[in-house]
């Protein structure tokens, strides 16, 4: 993770191995989703800035007994490098603005999609 | 399903302008940037550009820089690629390929296009 | 620009036959390299990405391996419908890049 700062080299850098799995993780939330995700579950929403990752895992292990979301739960715990408990709560969230799970993972993933398009995109 | 549909054929000739479009369904339009290869009669694939329909990023192959452009029309999920200033080696079919990101692989492409230049 | 070398440029084989085609890149592009089949008169199409995950779809006798610099795609057991071009893809950087292609012909 510490490599996102150089995206704006001149050429693309692709993501860790680890950050691709995060990625095709999301991607296939958003593509298989039939049902309201995790039930319609709220979560706070949260600055997709540089802790973004702790942030997203503070917000979504607030969600319990959604097996839908568990992996991607794993892969953010391996992105922080702090443990993270339910309840916790960090400057990164955007706290009087709940939005559904489903738009959560949604925009989580379309940010990791622009930071890896960057410097890539004029 | 996942359907990527081309313009049909084009003669042109030297010195003019051609515009290939590739109207995308079957997913998320802005979901997936949409790269251009393109292919020489007997000829390997040659990577041109691509653009992301989100923001309306490019990124083109310095081959091509200052003779392609590359948009995008959300409204009607069509991408185009226009190539100016033909030569007769731009002869070629042209694909349209998704891909949703850079280094993913190109999993569904467009049935191609030929654009001939001749006088 | 990372240049991708395939070889052989023609391979000869028989059907049931093994195919072994190489891929070979100018610098160490980890796994993002791709491999496409194309036919006569048609678009390309994703046989194998990341080096050796399969495709959903696609035969089991398709299969990809390599990391860095050095890939092979293997075709254990030629159908009659596998002889075609191959072409391997650098999903590495920009620009992205092709290989010239390997034509797996009927011997």
């Known amino acids: 993770l510490t490599c996102l700062g150089g995206f704006a080299s001149p050429g693309p850098v692709p993501p860790s191995t680890a950050l691709r799995e995060l990625i095709e993780e999301l991607v296939n939330i958003t593509q298989n989703q039939k049902a309201p995700l995790c039930n319609g579950s709220m979560v706070w929403s949260i600055n997709l800035t540089a802790g973004m990752y702790c942030a997203a895992l503070e917000s979504l292990i607030n969600v319990s007994g959604c097996s839908a979301i568990e992996k991607t739960q794993r892969m953010l715990s391996g992105f922080c490098p702090h443990k993270v408990s339910a309840g916790q709560f960090s400057s990164l969230h955007v706290r009087d603005t709940k939005i559904e799970v489903a738009q959560f993972v949604k925009d989580l993933l379309l940010h990791l999609k622009k930071l890896f398009r960057e410097g890539q995109f004029n | 399903q996942v359907q990527l549909v081309q313009s049909g054929a084009e003669v042109k000739k030297p010195g003019a302008s051609v515009k290939v479009s590739c109207k995308a369904s079957?997913?998320?339009?802005?979901?997936?940037?949409i790269h251009w290869v393109r292919q020489a009669p007997g000829q390997g694939l040659e990577w041109m550009g691509a653009i992301d329909p989100e923001t309306g990023g490019t990124a083109y192959n310095q081959k091509f820089k200052g003779r392609v452009t590359m948009t995008t029309d959300t409204s009607t999920s069509t991408a185009y690629m226009e190539l100016r200033s033909l030569r007769s080696d731009d002869t070629a079919v042209y694909y349209c390929t998704r891909i949703l990101l850079y280094y993913y692989p190109m999993d569904y492409w467009g049935q191609g296009t030929l654009v001939t230049v001749s006088s | 620009e990372i240049v991708l070398t395939q070889s052989p440029a023609t391979l000869s084989l028989s059907p049931g036959e093994r195919a072994t085609l190489s891929c070979r890149a100018s610098q160490n592009i980890s796994d993002y390299l791709h491999w496409y089949q194309q036919k006569p008169g048609q678009a390309p199409r994703l046989l194998i990405y990341y080096a050796s995950q399969s495709i959903s779809g696609i035969p089991a006798r398709f299969s990809g391996s390599g990391s860095g610099t050095d890939f092979t795609l293997t075709i254990n057991s030629l159908e009659p419908e596998d002889f075609a071009v191959y072409y391997c893809?650098?999903?590495?950087?920009?620009?992205?890049?092709l290989g010239g292609g390997t034509k797996v012909e009927i011997k």
């Open positions: 079957g997913y998320t339009f802005i979901d997936y940037e």
């Open positions: 893809q650098n999903g590495h950087s920009f620009p992205l890049t």
